[in-house]
């Protein structure tokens, strides 16, 4: 099972001091954002128990394996379901904590109920504040059952669930009608997928016999040990105040685990820590009781004394859960509760035993999960013990499970079960990723998803030129770092593959799929210089450049011209895709702008040194619009236009351009030049009679300027159809008759 614990601090005098902490003992837990471990998640689950919205809760991460939820402002914030999610991939596990209000109308006698498939579960809600009304039971938020208030037994409302099945699992609640849902008694029912003492897909496998209140997991047969106990069968007690699968975690605060509720992966659920009991886990065990929730009884024999955290403490000469075994009976010594090996390895397993008479090599045997018995190949006999060594045949996945070391002498026998985990070396599912490339190096990210088991201890990157038969080059890197492959050949394809390893002998996995990574071209080294440039218009610039003469072929694919407009902070780039080109026309520039200009040779994606920069000023754009344009009909075919010269001219006007268009017409407009720029009047002739026309005009210096306003005018009536408009200009002070 995943080593994941959700701790709830139940000192409830002040909700602001309440906190929930999720602790993971998994390797690489909670690192997030990398390929080796998703983060721990800790949140309130409002899907079933909804509480009034309040300020958001604060999540604080303490290192990679711990996350804490705080910021509860009022007691109602605490009521409901909280969950912590940890572990990676198929081992991703959710641990659930259900919090009841101490002031509720109904309180659960026991919050977590773990039962076997087919059992009868009984949920008991104790009356705390009586109401003479029905009690509604809900399952996962939906109506389930009604009890009349007369049906209370000894101040309790009982919900009996016969023949429970796994789908019956979930959150149950008991609530008085017309009472706030926050006053409900909330329960968690966990139904194991198998009957008592069984596990596995068809429930065909036998559980190891979990001790001290441990619960056999119905999927993998492992014991989920209560807080404060460890070992394959939960046979060992942790030191006071410690928890976690290896007793590696310590309860916070000076009073140890007092006032803390511990929630572990299903099918365990939640309980107080070892040595504590009560709804708020603040009461020490009564004499003769020990363990989580003080559920266990010592019943020590032969002078043993009861410790509320660990159970019987035996006097010398005795051992066993109740001090019932004499030290003369043979005893397996210091057997690890869990061993890990890699697939297809042939490990050596040691098993040590003591006793009177003294165990010899033939009296110690090793039994595999399939029942195969291995005899030791050699034994080391020391004054206080005999250590038998077993050479294990090549391991297969089916060897995962509970192995047993057994010693038999005339004084009796002892056996110790231990878990063997056969791990599959990791194999990359994808090729490594190219991050950046240069002409002689590649930067590669080796982090890829993989099949098999972690944690990843080393990453090997194998590479060689594509289509080469030479040996692979290998570089060993830290799993979390990117790799730089150096001293490569330019413009060359390399085949690159990842190989992952996990700890232990035979932990190297097969090579992952190859990928082709190509180094960049050589950098161009020649520096061009600008020969010259000239302006071909207000927005056009002709540029020419040269390159130094060097022997050999030119290393380059083309040129990059860069124009920098410092005023606007804008850069214009122009690509000239021929390495033979030595001139370019730049168009669409901004008139009246001061540019800094340079040119660079490029090769593939690499740029060579830039030429010394040149500074170019483009002439400004055309003049402003003519002012006060006016149209006046003179006859059935003539209209006179008058205007005033534009203001603030940047230079002398070379001409005016008039645009003539029939109002509402669909045809193209006609443009007429007025070539005497000093004039402020012109007559447009050859127009159609009784026709409405639109006019506008603009001036030209080096370029055309802005259009004036548009004016409308109609010719006088009933003339003949004209051939088309023409123009005659006069200075405004001249007479108009000819």
């Amino acid at each position: 099972a995943v080593d994941l614990t959700l701790l709830a601090n139940l000192r409830l005098t002040d909700p602001q001091r309440f906190f929930l902490t999720c602790v993971s003992g998994e390797a690489g837990a909670g690192r997030g954002s990398d390929a080796w471990g998703p983060p721990l998640l800790l949140e309130k689950d409002d899907r079933i128990v909804r509480t009034p919205p309040g300020p958001p809760l604060r999540l604080a991460r303490n290192g990679s394996h711990q996350v804490t939820l705080r910021g509860f402002s009022k007691p109602s914030d605490l009521v409901g379901v909280f969950s912590c999610v940890g572990g990676a991939g198929a081992r991703r596990t959710r641990v659930i904590y259900v919090h009841n209000s101490p002031g509720a109308h109904l309180l659960p006698d026991k919050v977590t109920h773990t039962v076997n498939k087919g059992d009868t579960a009984v949920l008991s809600a104790r009356v705390h504040k009586e109401k003479q009304t029905d009690v509604i039971w809900k399952s996962n938020g939906s109506y389930f059952y009604t009890l009349d208030w007369h049906e209370a037994q000894d101040g309790r409302f009982l919900l009996q669930l016969p023949n429970v099945q796994p789908p019956s699992s979930g959150i149950y609640s008991a609530t008085y009608l017309e009472a706030s849902p926050l006053g409900s008694a909330f329960f968690r029912l966990i139904v194991r997928g198998c009957g008592a003492g069984r596990w596995g897909p068809g429930c065909t496998k036998e559980c190891p016999g979990c001790l001290h209140g441990g619960v056999c997991h119905d999927h993998d047969g492992e014991c989920v040990c209560p807080p404060g106990f460890t070992g394959t069968r939960c046979e060992q007690a942790c030191r006071e105040g410690r928890f976690g699968q290896s007793c590696q975690e310590q309860c916070p605060g000076i009073s140890g685990c007092r006032g803390l509720t511990f929630c572990l992966p299903d099918p365990y659920g939640c309980s107080c820590g070892s040595g504590w009991r009560g709804s708020q886990c603040q009461e020490a065990c009564a004499p003769g009781h020990f363990g989580a929730d003080c559920r266990l009884q010592c019943q020590c024999q032969n002078g043993g004394t009861c410790d509320r955290f660990s159970g019987c403490v035996c006097p010398s000469g005795w051992h066993g859960v109740h001090c019932e075994k004499s030290d003369r009976i043979p005893q397996i010594l210091n057997m690890a509760s869990e061993l890990e090996f890699n697939l297809e390895t042939m490990p050596r397993i040691n098993c040590a035993a003591a006793g009177n008479p003294f165990p010899v090599r033939g009296s110690i045997e090793l039994r595999k999960p399939d029942g195969t018995v291995l005899l030791s190949t050699k034994a080391i006999v020391e004054p206080e013990k005999t250590t038998a060594e077993f050479e294990v045949p090549r391991l297969v996945l089916a060897d995962s499970g509970f192995w047993e070391c057994r010693v038999s002498t005339s004084g009796g026998q002892d056996s110790r079960r231990f878990k063997v985990n056969v791990k599959v070396p990791p194999v990359p599912l994808a090729a490594p990723r190219l991050l950046t490339k240069q002409s002689r190096q590649l930067v590669v990210s080796p982090l890829v998803s993989f099949s098999g088991d972690g944690p990843i201890s080393t990453v090997r990157l194998h590479y060689r030129p594509q289509d080469s038969t030479m040996d692979w080059s290998t570089i060993v890197v830290d799993p979390s770092e990117n790799v730089t492959l150096m001293n490569l050949r330019p413009k060359t394809g390399y085949s690159v593959r990842v190989q992952l390893s996990r700890p232990g002998e035979g932990g190297e996995g097969a090579w992952g799929p190859p990928t082709l990574m190509t180094t960049d071209c050589p950098e161009p080294l020649l520096q061009p210089w600008l020969e010259g440039w000239h302006v071909e218009g207000t927005d056009r610039l002709r540029v020419s450049w040269s390159l130094p003469l060097v022997p050999g072929p030119l290393v380059g694919d083309g040129f990059l011209l860069r124009l920098w407009d410092g005023t606007r902070g804008q850069e214009r780039r122009e690509n000239v895709s021929s390495p033979q080109a030595r001139t370019a026309l730049l168009t669409g520039l901004t008139p009246g702008t001061h540019y800094q200009l340079d040119v660079q040779l490029y090769h593939c994606t690499l740029l060579g040194p830039a030429s010394p920069p040149a500074h170019v000023l483009l002439p400004p754009s055309g003049p402003p619009a003519p002012r006060h344009l006016h149209a006046q009909a003179l006859s059935d075919s003539e209209i006179q236009l008058t205007w005033k010269h534009p203001e603030a001219l940047p230079g002398p006007i070379s001409k005016y351009v008039v645009e003539v268009q029939v109002a509402g017409g669909a045809g193209d407009p006609l443009w007429i030049d007025v070539d005497r720029p000093e004039e402020t009047s012109t007559i447009i002739r050859g127009l159609n009679a009784s026709t409405r026309y639109l006019f506008r005009m603009r001036a030209s210096i080096q370029g055309l300027g802005d259009w004036s306003n548009t004016v409308e005018e109609s010719t006088l009536g009933n003339g003949l159809q004209a051939e088309g408009p023409v123009q005659e200009s006069r200075a405004a002070e001249e007479g108009l008759d000819q």
């Epitope: 009304t133 029905d134 059952y145 009604t146 208030w149 009608l177 017309e178 009472a179 706030s180 849902p181």
Partner: antibody, heavy 126, light 108 residues
Framework: EVQLLESGGGLVQPGGSLRLSCAAS????????MHWVRQAPGKGFEWVSS????????YYADSVKGRFTISRDNSKNTLYLQMNSLRAEDTAVYYC???????????????????WGQGTTVTVSS | DIQMTQSPSSLSASVGDRVTITCRAS??????LNWYQHKPGKAPELLIS???SLQSGVPSRFSGSGSGTDFTLTISSLRPEDFATYYC??????????FGPGTKVDVK
């Protein structure tokens, strides 16, 4: 389909007895509080009796107390009303109904009759 | 016991009319009031729970309001299938349930 079907009605003389049945289908009968409601000709509805899911507690209207007995058989998904000492004023169409609870954010509300049967007619006449 | 009264006892209306029925409890029942529709020879149908909560599948032209002792059922635009008798029912007492005498809505 969720359904209630009453049966057992008929013509009976004053002082006589009759047993009504209500067969439930389409839902888990054993989890719900059940009721009998009647409607006399030309009159409104009158609640008659109710029984809790376990069958262990019952309630009656004053007008039928001591004469009528409500019961249920959860294994047969059936509700019963045993009517003794019948009177002319017991003449009515008798309906069985399922009680459900309306829930909103402020808490639970007591019964509404969300499923009704089509009714069975009881006539008490000499 | 809580007594329920309804008014009017009957009303005639046309399709498209807005119809309002009132129900009064002899003592405060909070919002613990349900409305039912009944057509002859059919099972009664629950329309509204808890004074104002429309039952799933009931058309939105039906609405309920009120709290304490005075309650209202409104049909915003009467349809042909709405001609029936309407009953209010208190659910404040958990052991006994009383109905109003009913309001018959028929064609004008």
């Amino acid at each position: 389909e969720v359904q209630l079907l009453e049966s057992g009605g008929g013509l009976v003389q004053p002082g006589g007895s009759l047993r009504l049945s209500c067969a439930a289908s389409g839902f888990t009968f054993s989890r719900y509080k059940m009721h009998w409601v009647r409607q006399a000709p030309g009159k409104g509805f009158e609640w008659v009796s109710s029984i809790v899911p376990s069958g262990g507690w019952t309630y009656y209207a004053d007008s039928v107390k001591g004469r009528f007995t409500i019961s249920r058989d959860n294994s047969k998904n059936t509700l019963y009303l045993q009517m003794n000492s019948l009177r002319a004023e017991d003449t009515a169409v008798y309906y069985c109904a399922r009680q459900m609870y309306y829930y909103d954010s402020s808490g639970y509300y007591v019964g509404r009759f969300d499923i009704w049967g089509q009714g069975t007619t009881v006539t008490v006449s000499s | 016991d809580i007594q329920m009264t309804q008014s009017p006892s009957s009303l005639s209306a046309s399709v498209g009319d807005r119809v309002t029925i009132t129900c009064r409890a002899s003592q405060s029942i909070n919002t613990y009031l349900n409305w039912y529709q009944h057509k002859p020879g059919k099972a009664p149908e629950l329309l509204i729970s808890a004074a104002s909560s429309l039952q799933s599948g009931v058309p939105s032209r039906f609405s309920g309001s009120g709290s304490g002792t005075d309650f209202t059922l409104t049909i915003s635009s009467l349809r042909p299938e709405d001609f029936a008798t309407y009953y209010c029912q208190q659910s404040h007492s958990i052991s006994t349930f009383t109905f109003g005498p009913g309001t018959k809505v028929d064609v004008k």
